[in-house]
Amino acid sequence: MAVTACQGLGFVVSLIGIAGIIAATCMDQWSTQDLYNNPVTAVFNYQGLWRSCVRESSGFTECRGYFTLLGLPAMLQAVRALMIVGIVLGAIGLLVSIFALKCIRIGSMEDSAKANMTLTSGIMFIVSGLCAIAGVSVFANMLVTNFWMSTANMYTGMGGMVQTVQTRYTFGAALFVGWVAGGLTLIGGVMMCIACRGLAPEETNYKAVSYHASGHSVAYKPGGFKASTGFGSNTKNKKIYDGGARTEDEVQSYPSKHDYV
């Protein structure tokens, strides 16, 4: 019962998480104009992974896609890739986990197969969550770097009493959605992995019984047979995901330069 609950909850949590990752990827508000230095601006800029938008105080909003692939910063491309990989893995994980659910009967599928599928989906959810968290974090790091760079030259041209205020960008709603969604997917994946242990058929240990033959004192001790589950030792020391932290030497100014190539 506890296993079913853990599995079911893991599935639901992952489902919410993946829906969140999809939402975050599609959202336009990955970075939003920082209004701290110019709170009276009548024009509000915000940018996503796929397009940048301008909302005027009239309510008129104009969005323009990044109609280029090669002209975009490598970091933005990397974030896109991480989010898409996260979505794809999550979607496959959801598909696999549906069939792995203990409460769903599919033909004469054995518990060992269900345990296998639960573990597979769990690992997929974990990697999916990590991809989303990594993607969002890379973007956030990019924003922080650019924020301080633009702060350093906030007013570019004080000559003749003319101020040119450079637009700075801060964290948008999509980043928070992405972090939470990635975390939920990760938690869901861990829950699935925990559930898989409970789904595995338990070891059948037959007690050793002595058979005394009339003439000979030979004892037959049948060994403790392990039910083959298919996910024993072979996955124990497998490296699931390598987060590979990297430092980006060349800070790319994203995305104003590359908006309309």
Epitope: T41, A42, N45, F60, D259
Partner: antibody, heavy 119, light 113 residues
Amino acid sequence: QVQLVQSGAEVKKPGASVKLSCKASGYTFTSYWMHWVRQAPGQGLEWIGMIHPNSGSTNYNEKFKSRATLTVDTSTSTAYMELSSLRSEDTAVYYCARRYYGSISPDYWGQGTTVTVSS
Amino acid sequence: DIQMTQSPSSLSASVGDRVTMTCKSSQSLLNSGNQKNYLTWYQQKPGKAPKLLIYWASTRESGVPSRFSGSGSGTDFTLTISSLQPEDFATYYCQNDYSYPFTFGGGTKLEIK
């Protein structure tokens, strides 16, 4: 066609209040910002503030924030501007203007209401 | 607040002339997000309400004759009337549309020579 019809001229004493109206027709009143702009005799234009009829959201010029109040009555498609603690320098023509949707600029203006503040 | 300075304050010209007036803002009106300049030009005739001519510094409002054109970016803007017509004699105002409060220039009065 779009029309903004403003109330008639007003003569007020210093310290009094005046409430001007602007009746809109020919468009969806709740979809556009309504601006109020004034022009003192022989002077330039001065933006007072704006209101969104749908949300009631307002934005004021700091200069008028303490004295001007913008309101709307969506049932009659009418915008109002009340200016309190009137002084002689408030003598001006007051215009209401509809917010242009493709940009921030107002594209339709009322005919203006002359407010004279004199003791 | 953004200060808008128009020059000249008055200008005499004849019908058919090419006329140019300028508007300077104390702060850039260029929005990096869409590369648009949030500056508007109005025409006002005595006793009448202002009429929108140009927005986004260079986009003509529908119904405005093609002889009117706007140009410039950042802090320096220009309104050009290629061939003056009798109905063009009026006062022209530029307006900051980029930040609150929206501010207007002092105006350029275009008179018949």
